[in-house]
């Protein structure tokens, strides 16, 4: 079966991109067609992660599927189209002037993408302007082989960047998470994401977010005051997608930021985060690269306590156990630490207020030749009720001016053996990191001290 629909406002079209499904337009399917699709959907969610080289965890530690392996598998699955949103591309060592064997996985991925194009599978890339990889030739190489590339001028449009990181493959499969299209994300940076297979409902909903970037990537694009109806979502916080993931009853939805890129029905990312925090009754565990209750990249900085207040309120008013694991690397802005200390200062076990903050330090070891690496880049949160996997760091810019996406998943325990729910898996990954020797309490982190592994 094939879904063919007429072109819609500015959206990617064949050969432009996917030839066999609705290009991000609203599902206006005939009942029978919808039924066929439902039968064909057998959604499966797999957590994926990158563990940097030379970062051993204790023997027997839980781990998710390696990200590089998952990406290569997704590309093997592709038959029609691959849509990628990524802040920047830097899949080869020479891109950043580095000669290191750990770039080989990224280079293999770039090769694989070129092979896809050779097999007449369409590739559409939305990337950011401004970008972090101004010397990278990856996108020129792919464009020369037929990939469509659009640089979305978020700097001009919203004074932010396109910081999203996700793939939609054949309108059925998804990757989303913290990893950019960067070889370091596969071997030198700690990342966390999710792959969802065989789930056209969710994939085509996420495709609508890709389409918002795509239409803004044309010359002289302007932000629409109201997004056309075909960008609207019917899957959100109030009406999540409901289905069986590997037999487990699951609800899920994608959120997006900034609000200016949230068409009707799309839950804003900040709202999703706050909703997950607000519904927690036992614990909130969050792992984010950066945590600033301020603006980040604008001058002068403004105070922005929205997430900070939500964590404090959960701990203080509801007795929720809060754990925050923040990254600490050579390129970490040290002005973050006073905010972390302030948050932790709220903790008062005697009054049943539990707030713990640690920093995660990836030892540089003999990888000092690789810039902007050896860091925990993950952006996720888990409660006893839900898993949130995101692409945004926790400061105002990422929610007000910069693009990002979040995935909120809740699975019903008891339908499967214990430990099978996504939120339980994510909790275990968090606790593995939290209890590892790389997670250091703030007391062990002198003010202004460089984030250098002292182990």
């Amino acid at each position: 079966w094939q879904v063919r629909r007429p072109p819609t406002w500015g959206q990617v079209q064949p050969k432009d991109v996917p030839r066999s499904w609705g290009h991000g337009s609203s599902p206006a399917l005939e009942p029978l067609e919808a039924e066929v699709r439902k039968q064909r959907d057998s959604c499966q969610l797999v957590l994926v992660e990158s563990i940097p080289q030379d970062l051993p965890f204790a023997a027997g530690s839980l781990s998710a599927q390696p990200l590089g392996q998952a990406w290569l598998q997704l590309l093997d699955t592709a038959q029609e189209s691959v849509h990628v949103a990524s802040y920047y591309w830097s899949l080869t060592g020479p891109d950043i002037g580095v000669n290191d064997s750990s770039s080989q996985l990224g280079e293999a991925l770039l090769q694989k993408l070129q092979q896809l194009l050779g097999r007449n599978i369409s590739l559409a890339v939305a990337t950011s302007s401004p970008t972090l990889a101004r010397k990278s030739t990856d996108l020129q190489v792919l464009a020369a082989r037929g990939a469509q590339v659009r640089r979305v001028p978020m700097g001009r449009l919203t004074r932010g960047v396109l910081h999203s990181k996700f793939w939609v493959v054949d309108g059925r499969h998804i990757y989303m998470g913290s990893a950019n299209m960067d070889w370091r994300s596969l071997t030198q940076v700690k990342e966390l994401g999710a792959v969802i297979y065989n789930c056209s409902h969710l994939a085509q909903d996420l495709e609508k977010t890709f389409q918002t970037y795509w239409v803004l990537g044309v010359p002289k694009a302007v932000l629409p005051k109201t997004w056309p109806q075909n960008f609207s979502s019917h899957i959100n916080r109030f009406q999540p997608f409901q289905g069986l993931f590997d037999g487990v009853p699951t609800t899920a939805y994608f959120s997006a930021s900034p609000p200016a890129l949230c068409p009707q029905g799309r839950t804003p990312d900040l709202e999703a985060l706050l909703a997950v925090m607000g519904s927690a009754q036992e614990f909130i565990y969050a792992s984010v690269m950066e945590y600033f209750p301020t603006t980040r990249f604008s001058h002068p900085r403004r105070y922005w306590p929205v997430l900070d207040n939500a964590l404090r309120a959960a701990a203080f008013s509801k007795g929720v156990r809060v754990r925050l694991l923040v990254s600490c690397g050579l390129n970490t802005d040290p002005t973050m630490f006073p905010y972390l200390r302030s948050l932790q200062a709220l903790s008062n076990p005697a009054a049943n207020v539990s707030v713990d903050v640690k920093v995660f330090i990836v030892p540089v070891g003999n990888h000092s030749n690789i810039p902007f690496s050896r860091v925990n880049h993950s952006k996720f949160m888990v409660t006893e009720k839900a898993a949130y996997i995101g692409t945004s760091n926790w400061s105002e810019d990422y929610f007000s001016s910069t693009t990002g996406v979040g995935l909120v998943v809740t699975q019903s325990p008891g339908a499967q053996p214990a430990g099978a729910t996504v939120q339980e898996q994510l909790r275990q990954l968090f606790e593995r990191d939290w209890s590892s020797r790389y997670a250091v309490g703030l007391d062990g982190q002198a003010p202004g001290q460089d984030c250098v592994w002292q182990g």
Epitope: Y87, S128, S129, P130, T131, L132, R134, K135, R151, P153, G155, R156, V161, H163, M289, E290, F297, S327, G329, L330, N331, T332, D333, P334, S368, P371, F372, V375, H377, N393, D450
Partner: antibody, heavy 124, light 107 residues
Framework: DVQLQESGPGLVKPSQSLSLTCSVT???????YYWTWIRQFPGNKLEWM?????????NYNPSLKNRISITRDTSKNQFFLKLNSVTTEDTATYNC?????????????????WGAGTTVTVSS | DIQMTQTTSSLSASLGDRVTISCRAS??????LNWYQQKPDGTVKLLIY???RLHSGVPSRFSGSGSGTDYSLTISNLEQEDVATYFC?????????FGGGTKLEIK
């Protein structure tokens, strides 16, 4: 407050080496920035010469590549410029500056702190 | 290397005037452009980064705009303390390159 101050001889003979020091106070040169030398020729033209990164790596202007070296002494929080085989064309005011900030995810880089500059004349 | 050209090497204007200084790159620099002010005593200060973002402490009468190869710095209400030379600088690629400067004087 971050401050940068250049020092070194004001007069250098042709064919000799020019050596300058930039002393940094209020910030560690092992953190978050490219520590840069920029010179301004008579008539105002500015030329980026090169940097030493927070991690000790270098990048130089190809027009100077065979003559320039930028090093540092982290214990003194200083970085240095050495320019070999100078000619009268190297007469300029030499400024040190920092470029960055090189925080994760930040695409906006600029020279936000400059030294006052030191004038070097190349003459026999 | 990317060449940066400021065609006007000097200009004079009256207090309160709106002044625009332009800068052209030899190729598209995708908004990776900064503006600096050099006072007569030689001190250099960052004014604007990434084409249009005002640096901390810079008065709001300064603004920047442009795209592709053409950029400009505007001072909306000229004050005596704005007497200086203004430089554009690209950070799209290495080596970093600067415009030749525009010297601004008061009539």
């Amino acid at each position: 407050d971050v401050q940068l101050q250049e020092s070194g001889p004001g007069l250098v003979k042709p064919s000799q080496s020019l050596s300058l020091t930039c002393s940094v106070t209020g910030y560690s040169i092992t953190s978050h920035y490219y520590w840069t030398w920029i010179r301004q020729f008579p008539g105002n033209k500015l030329e980026w010469m090169g940097y030493i990164s927070y991690d000790g790596s270098n990048n130089y202007n190809p027009s100077l590549k065979n003559r320039i070296s930028i090093t540092r002494d982290t214990s003194k929080n200083q970085f240095f410029l050495k320019l070999n085989s100078v000619t009268t064309e190297d007469t300029a005011t030499y400024n040190c500056a920092r470029e960055g900030p090189l925080y994760y995810g930040n695409p906006y880089w600029y020279f936000d702190v400059w030294g006052a500059g030191t004038t070097v004349t190349v003459s026999s | 290397d990317i060449q940066m050209t400021q065609t006007t090497s000097s200009l004079s204007a009256s207090l309160g005037d709106r002044v625009t200084i332009s800068c052209r790159a030899s190729q598209d620099i995708d908004n990776y452009l900064n503006w600096y002010q050099q006072k007569p005593d030689g001190t250099v200060k960052l004014l604007i980064y990434y084409t249009s973002r005002l640096h901390s402490g810079v008065p709001s009468r300064f603004s920047g705009s442009g795209s592709g190869t053409d950029y400009s710095l505007t001072i909306s209400n000229l004050e005596q303390e704005d007497v200086a030379t203004y430089f554009c600088q690209q950070f799209n690629t290495l080596p970093r390159t600067f415009g030749g400067g525009t010297k601004l004087e008061i009539k």
